[in-house]
């Protein structure tokens, strides 16, 4: 009886199992019982990344500079181009279709994790004893100045946005 299912890397057509084309190649003509599947390599700037029976290769992705994109990994006949974002920007999705500017951490917040081409800045509130008085995509929360180590006393308490103000100790009269 003619086959109704085929092995891995084969496909069923006209009651016959034909070999799929390997990654990097496209289908030109199905096999017959006299000749094997005819496949051709993908052209320049084209790819197919699976065993397939596609009659056309896919175009390599274009990393559009106007959208802040640049090439992270060049495409091959078997893989698509991988894009990432320019410095200071990050991808809006896993597919990295567009980029947005890294967020900055507002005063009172410090950078917990610096942004990459694929992830945004992660901010954290400055805990007691730490402060950030700038809006930054790089600066962590800084510890309050230790007045004691300078033989000074706290004249004004610190907050999450301001450092403590140190001053001289009162002298005994």
């Amino acid at each position: 009886e003619p086959p109704t299912a085929c092995r891995e890397k084969q496909y069923l057509i006209n009651s016959q199992c034909c070999s799929l084309c390997q990654p990097g190649q496209k289908l030109v003509s199905d096999c017959t019982e006299f000749t094997e599947t005819e496949c051709l390599p993908c052209g320049e700037s084209e790819f197919l990344d699976t065993w397939n029976r596609e009659t056309h290769c896919h175009q390599h992705r274009h990393c559009e500079p106007n959208q802040g994109l640049r090439v992270k990994k060049e495409g091959t006949a078997e893989s698509d181009t991988v894009c990432t974002c320019e410095e200071g920007w990050h991808c809006t999705s896993e597919a990295c279709e567009s980029c947005v500017l890294h967020r900055s951490c507002s005063p009172g917040f410090g950078v917990k994790q610096i942004a990459t081409g694929v992830s945004d800045t992660i901010c954290e509130p400055c805990p007691v004893g730490f402060f950030s008085n700038v809006s930054s995509a790089f600066e962590k929360c800084h510890p309050w100045t230790s007045c004691e180590t300078k033989d000074l006393v706290v004249q004004q308490a610190g907050t999450n946005k301001t450092d403590v103000v140190c001053g001289p100790q009162d002298r005994l009269r």
């Epitope: 017959t32 019982e33 006299f34 094997e36």
Partner: antibody
């Protein structure tokens, strides 16, 4: 035992017709693709035509396309080659062969076709 | 059609010799190649299929190799019954085509 026996060859004038037969035995004929291969006197082998199993497609070499017709009768375990508009260059021994995995594993003894006036 | 070119066209060798016949395709055919042996007045016999697989019942002194466009048939130690004509045949593209043959003669 697999056997393929060709018949129907002979002398024919240019422009004439001939029908070759190939009687198969010793295997399930309908399950196999079959083909005709020819060999001109003192020359090499030339694949002429093939027919798929289970009434599959038919295929021809460019040199015979439109003039030759391959067919099969699974109830009679017989392969045919109808040859029309014969030319001198069709003179050859014609072999029928069984196909398996893209190779011809069993061949008949051949039948001679001579096209001459 | 794909052209298959065999070399040499003829070859003289002695019993016990190691013999290599080559076959070149006009374009890549992966490993889609068969080898046949034909003796005078007889039908061809399948020796090697898929470039390197030995057909059942064929002696192990016959071997095949190659892929893409260049293929070889090797007989490791010639026996008297090996003197014959050898043909390669591609099945990578329609229609299947044969090489012109290599005649192996006794030296």
């Amino acid at each position: 035992e697999v056997q393929l026996l060709e018949s129907g060859g002979g002398l024919v004038q240019p422009g004439g017709s001939l029908r070759l037969s190939c009687a198969a035995s010793g295997f399930t004929f309908s399950s196999y693709a079959m083909s005709w291969v020819r060999q001109a006197p003192g020359k090499g082998l030339e694949w002429v035509s093939g027919i798929g199993s289970y009434g599959g497609g038919t295929y021809y070499a460019d040199s015979v396309k439109g003039r030759f017709t391959i067919s099969r009768d699974n109830s009679k375990n017989t392969l045919y080659l109808q040859m029309n508009s014969l030319r001198a260059e069709d003179t050859a021994v014609y072999y029928c062969a069984r196909y398996v995995n893209f190779g011809m594993d069993y061949w008949g003894q051949g039948t001679l076709v001579t096209v001459s006036s | 059609d794909i052209q298959m070119t065999q070399s040499p066209s003829s070859l003289s060798a002695s019993v016990g010799d190691r013999v290599t016949i080559t076959c070149r395709a006009s374009q890549s055919i992966s490993s889609y190649l068969n080898w046949y042996q034909q003796k005078p007045g007889k039908a061809p016999k399948l020796l090697i299929y898929a470039a390197s697989s030995l057909q059942s019942g064929v002696p192990s002194r016959f071997s095949g190799s190659g892929s893409g466009t260049d293929f070889t048939l090797t007989i490791s130690s010639l026996q008297p019954e090996d003197f014959a004509t050898y043909y390669c045949q591609q099945y990578g593209r329609n229609p299947p085509t044969f090489g012109q043959g290599t005649k192996l003669e006794i030296k």
